[in-house]
Interface confidence: medium
């Protein structure tokens, strides 16, 4: 039977009975939070061969091996992952070995085996036979290998039964437990699976098969399963489903979303039966099973019961995520916050239409309204007293409304009101009148010319760049010296720069009044010589990266109406030079004949330019005659067994410092001090562990159902 849409077994080990008839779990399998140690020996699920998503084990007391529970689990497809992982074994206090001796393939995703204090037989499994890339595997904080003394079948009797492979330059036997070898197929099978008798399966099989070269005898399918056969693609009038099988239209029409029991059900799109239309598409009618492309962002209508939605925090803005049409009024009152501009853009950036009015007051954290980056229509169906549909009052740091060169905003009905916005230039308000079509609607007192813009550089002159020079990680720029009417009023310049993959940034992007700013800022003092052009060297930049740069003059000059006069440049886009790329990732080599090696790799994470070719070098190595590290028949050589505490053991990472060679001299000495890079890597590692653990806890701890 196919079980799904994901099975969560927690608290009571007897819930395992739910797996009794499952051959495939279409979805994930969680076994977790079973705090009372139980005897699992009577539980055995030999029918289970495939999990289409991931397997997660967390805090299951008393479980010592997975081999008895799932003796025939062959494939974990990883169609959906748990934080990039297809197999997670975390804080399993009593687990002694994984023991999944029939596990042959993890199709997508990595493995994370962490904080399992008694877990051995980890170094004896060659994960590269199961996964495509092992570089993302995370295996830490388990029982140290030195304390495990893992022995593969037959080793003690000097009749080893398992095959050998090389991991980290160590050629050794591969097994899951003391009596189960890791299965390997003959090299003649290449990438194909094989039967228990080492006959090669059909190319469409994955993991194993019950008969050779037969696409109906596969344990699992490499691509898709349909009507008892493994097929490379779904036949006509059938659709890919959950990443592993083909279903017909009727089947797709007949299933419900796992998340909701609404009537919409699944859709067919791009040859796949899926829960929802993908991003950028919408159903062709509410009862339709088909998707059509959206024009612009896909519409999502959001409504406020109380008519007026108050946005006074990121949390309240979160409710509007994905909304394109807001039925009601928006009252924005953001007095403080962290990284507020980008958070608001994240949650409100798709709103295109507000049917009522928009009121922004006491929002001292806002520098710009550009977070409403798609707002194009305020209908003004409901208005504030005085017939206002756009009302901006007492926002101490508001400097920009929108970038009017790239913004079409219409206010269909109602007037605008602006007062006590000391950093908002009146010219910016007048520009809004023109763009929105409200010019002539406002009466004289609606736009206050004295208390709007009273503390801003409203009369801006343009600064011009005079030269730019680039290297791989530096940019040197100079600009014309700005001469205000009184030279003594020029204090300094501020250079703003940031990475800008596209030429679409504005001065106010990601900026708020609480210190968050996506721009890096550098102050530049005036050159002492009046004839020297001011300039700056920006260093520590990334190679082959486009940066946006602009400069502002900091002045004191007052002009008419006591408004400050200032100067700033246009935004300049400039790319650093190319550099040497970082190393290629996930290098794998395998032999497919006696005279050939196949080498695969992924591109470098930092290409630092346009990659044009790779250089592959190889050399012949002498045969490695592997010696046993321990003579297990000699009493004094058996490693001391001590119970690991499940914390990350430093010995796994660094060797004994007393035997380290430092400064080119041999002999005992102190460990070399860690480099800054090593310290940073350790810090990032610790951070990554925390992030994963938080993700795990947030995912699995759920409120008890009512």
């Amino acid at each position: 039977e196919i079980c799904g849409p994901g099975i969560d077994i927690r608290n009571d080990y007897q819930q395992l009975k739910r797996l009794e008839n499952c051959t495939v779990i279409e979805g994930y399998l969680h076994i977790l939070l079973i705090s009372k140690a139980e005897d699992y020996r009577s539980y055995r699920f030999p029918k289970l061969t495939v999990i289409t998503e991931y397997l997660l084990l967390f805090r299951v007391a008393g479980l010592e091996s997975l081999g008895d529970l799932f003796p025939n689990l062959t494939v974990i497809r990883g169609w959906k992952l748990f934080y990039n992982y297809a197999l997670v074994i975390f804080e399993m206090t009593n687990l002694k070995d994984i023991g999944l001796y029939n596990l042959r393939n993890i199709t997508r995703g990595a493995i994370r085996i962490e904080k399992n204090a008694d877990l051995c037989y980890l170094s004896t499994v060659d994960w590269s036979l199961i996964l495509d890339a092992v570089s993302n595997n995370y295996i830490v904080g388990n029982k140290p290998p030195k304390e495990c003394g893992d022995l593969c079948p037959g080793t003690m009797e000097e009749k080893p039964m398992c095959e050998k492979t090389t991991i980290n330059n160590e050629y050794n036997y591969r097994c899951w437990t003391t009596n189960r070898c890791q299965k390997m197929c003959p090299s003649t099978c290449g990438k194909r699976a094989c039967t228990e008798n080492n006959e090669c399966c059909h190319p469409e099989c994955l993991g194993s098969c019950s008969a050779p070269d037969n696409d109906t005898a596969c344990v699992a399918c490499r691509h898709y399963y349909y009507a008892g056969v493994c097929v490379p693609a779904c036949p006509p009038n059938t659709y890919r489903f959950e990443g592993w099988r083909c279903v017909d239209r009727d089947f797709c029409a007949n299933i419900l979303s796992a998340e909701s029991s609404d009537s919409e059900g699944f859709v067919i799109h791009d040859g796949e039966c899926m829960q929802e239309c993908p991003s950028g598409f919408i159903r062709n009618g509410s009862q339709s099973m088909y998707c059509i492309p959206c024009e612009g962002p896909c519409p999502k209508v959001c409504e406020e019961e109380k008519k007026t939605k108050t946005i006074d925090s990121v949390t309240s803005a979160q409710m509007l995520q994905g909304c394109t049409i807001f039925k009601g009024n928006l009252l924005i009152n953001i007095r403080r916050g962290n990284n507020i501009a980008s958070e608001l853009e994240n949650f409100m950036g798709l709103i295109e239409v507000v049917t009522g009015y928009v009121k922004i007051r006491h929002s001292h954290a806002l520098v710009s309204l550009s977070f409403l980056k798609n707002l194009r229509l305020i209908l003004g169906e409901e208005q504030l007293e005085g017939n206002y549909s756009f009302y901006v009052l007492d926002n101490q740091n508001l400097q920009q409304l929108w970038d009017w060169d790239h913004r079409n905003l219409t206010i269909k009905a109602g007037k605008m009101y602006f007062a006590f916005n000391p950093k908002l230039c009146v010219s910016e308000i007048y520009r809004m009148e023109e763009v929105t079509g409200t010019k002539g609607r406002q009466s004289k007192g609606d736009i206050n010319t004295r208390n709007n813009g009273e503390r801003a550089s409203c009369e801006s002159d343009v600064l011009h760049f005079t030269s730019t020079t680039t290297s791989k990680n530096r940019i040197i720029i100079t600009w014309h010296r700005y001469r205000p009417p009184d030279y003594r009023d020029l204090i300094s310049f501020t250079v703003y720069y940031k990475e800008a993959p596209f030429k679409n940034v504005t001065e106010y992007d990601g900026q708020d009044a609480c210190g968050s700013n996506s721009w890096n800022m550098v102050d530049v003092d005036l050159p002492p010589n009046k004839d020297v052009e001011p300039g700056i060297l920006l260093h520590g930049l990334k190679p082959w990266t486009q940066y946006a740069v602009y400069v502002k003059a900091v002045t004191l000059t007052m002009v008419e109406n006591d408004h400050i006069r200032g100067a700033k440049s246009e935004i300049l886009y400039i790319r650093t030079n190319a550099s040497v790329p970082s190393i290629p990732l996930d290098v794998l080599s395998a032999s497919n004949s006696s005279s050939q090696l196949i080498v695969k790799w992924n591109p470098p994470s930092l290409p630092n330019g346009n990659l044009s070719y790779y250089i592959v070098r190889w050399q012949r190595q002498p045969q490695d005659g592997y010696l046993y590290r321990h003579n297990y028949c000699s009493k004094d050589k058996i490693p001391i067994r001590k119970y690991a505490d499940g914390t990350i053991d430093i010995e796994e990472v660094t060797e004994n410092p007393k035997t380290e060679v430092c400064g080119g001299e041999k002999g005992p000495c102190c460990a070399c001090p860690k480099t800054e890079a090593e310290k940073q890597a350790e810090k990032e590692e610790a951070e990554y562990r925390k992030v994963f653990e938080n993700f795990l806890h947030n995912s699995i701890f759920v409120p008890r159902p009512e």
């Epitope: 349909y226 008892g228 017909d248 009727d250 089947f251 029991s261």
Partner: antibody, heavy 123, light 112 residues
Framework: EVQLQQSGPELVKPGASVRISCKAS????????MNWVKQSHGKSLEWVAN????????NYNQKFKDKATLTVDKSSNTAYMELRSLTSEDTAVYYC????????????????WGTGTLVTVSS | DVLMTQTPLSLPVSLGDHASISCRSS???????????LEWYLQKPGQSPKLLIY???NRFSGVPDRFSGSGSGTDFTLKISRVEAEDLGVYYC?????????FGGGTKLEIK
């Protein structure tokens, strides 16, 4: 085209047994339960039982537990219902109807019905 | 067993009229997951039954929008807004929530 083709009418003697068939075409046979429904002349419909073609697992209406036995032949995409110890009460049209086999996520309905097989029990 | 009681047994209508059929279950047919598997089928003379409505109110594909279902718990209704000649036949409600699954006694929609 999705079809459930049932075997022809049967005339059987009281006390005897009969096996009627339902051949599925146009869809993946193992993706759906096969249900059997009884309709006596001029009467309402009664659900008899269903079978999971993957493993032969069955659910019966207790009323028919000793009357009907369901089987499938996956190789020919055919479901069978055997009726035993027949009496005049068993005279009826028997329909097969498919029902999606998908735990926890299906809308559960009989979307395709067979043509019906009339079983007449008479001496 | 869950008993499904349909009323009326017979419903004479004129073409273009509205029609309403009621179905009552002897106990709640709401499943533990909150879903209610209540369906309506139409059987025309000499034919197999055909699905009209599933899960109380959802029209099956190809079913005209003049058919609508409503109800909750134990009381359910099928409405036909403007009866057409092709709508004549016997209507059955069906519960698929509890084994054994059961049909209502049927309501015959006929011309006055």
């Amino acid at each position: 085209e999705v079809q459930l083709q049932q075997s022809g009418p049967e005339l059987v003697k009281p006390g005897a047994s009969v096996r009627i068939s339902c051949k599925a075409s146009g869809y993946a046979f193992t993706d759906y339960y096969m249900n059997w429904v009884k309709q006596s002349h001029g009467k309402s419909l009664e659900w008899v039982a269903n079978i999971n073609p993957n493993n032969g697992g069955t659910n019966y209406n207790q009323k028919f537990k000793d009357k009907a036995t369901l089987t499938v032949d996956k190789s020919s995409n055919t479901a069978y219902m055997e009726l035993r110890s027949l009496t005049s009460e068993d005279t009826a049209v028997y329909y097969c109807a498919r029902w999606i086999l998908y735990y926890g996520r299906s809308k559960w309905y009989f979307d395709v019905w067979g043509t019906g097989t009339l079983v007449t029990v008479s001496s | 067993d869950v008993l499904m009681t349909q009323t009326p047994l017979s419903l004479p209508v004129s073409l273009g009229d509205h029609a309403s059929i009621s179905c009552r279950s002897s106990q709640s047919i709401v499943q533990s997951n909150g879903d209610t598997y209540l369906e309506w089928y139409l059987q025309k003379p000499g034919q197999s039954p055909k699905l009209l409505i599933y899960r109380i109110s959802n029209r099956f594909s190809g079913v005209p929008d003049r058919f609508s279902g409503s109800g909750s718990g134990t009381d359910f209704t099928l409405k036909i807004s403007r009866v057409e000649a092709e709508d004549l036949g016997v209507y059955y409600c069906f519960q698929g929530s509890h084994v054994p699954y059961t049909f209502g006694g049927g309501t015959k929609l006929e011309i006055k």
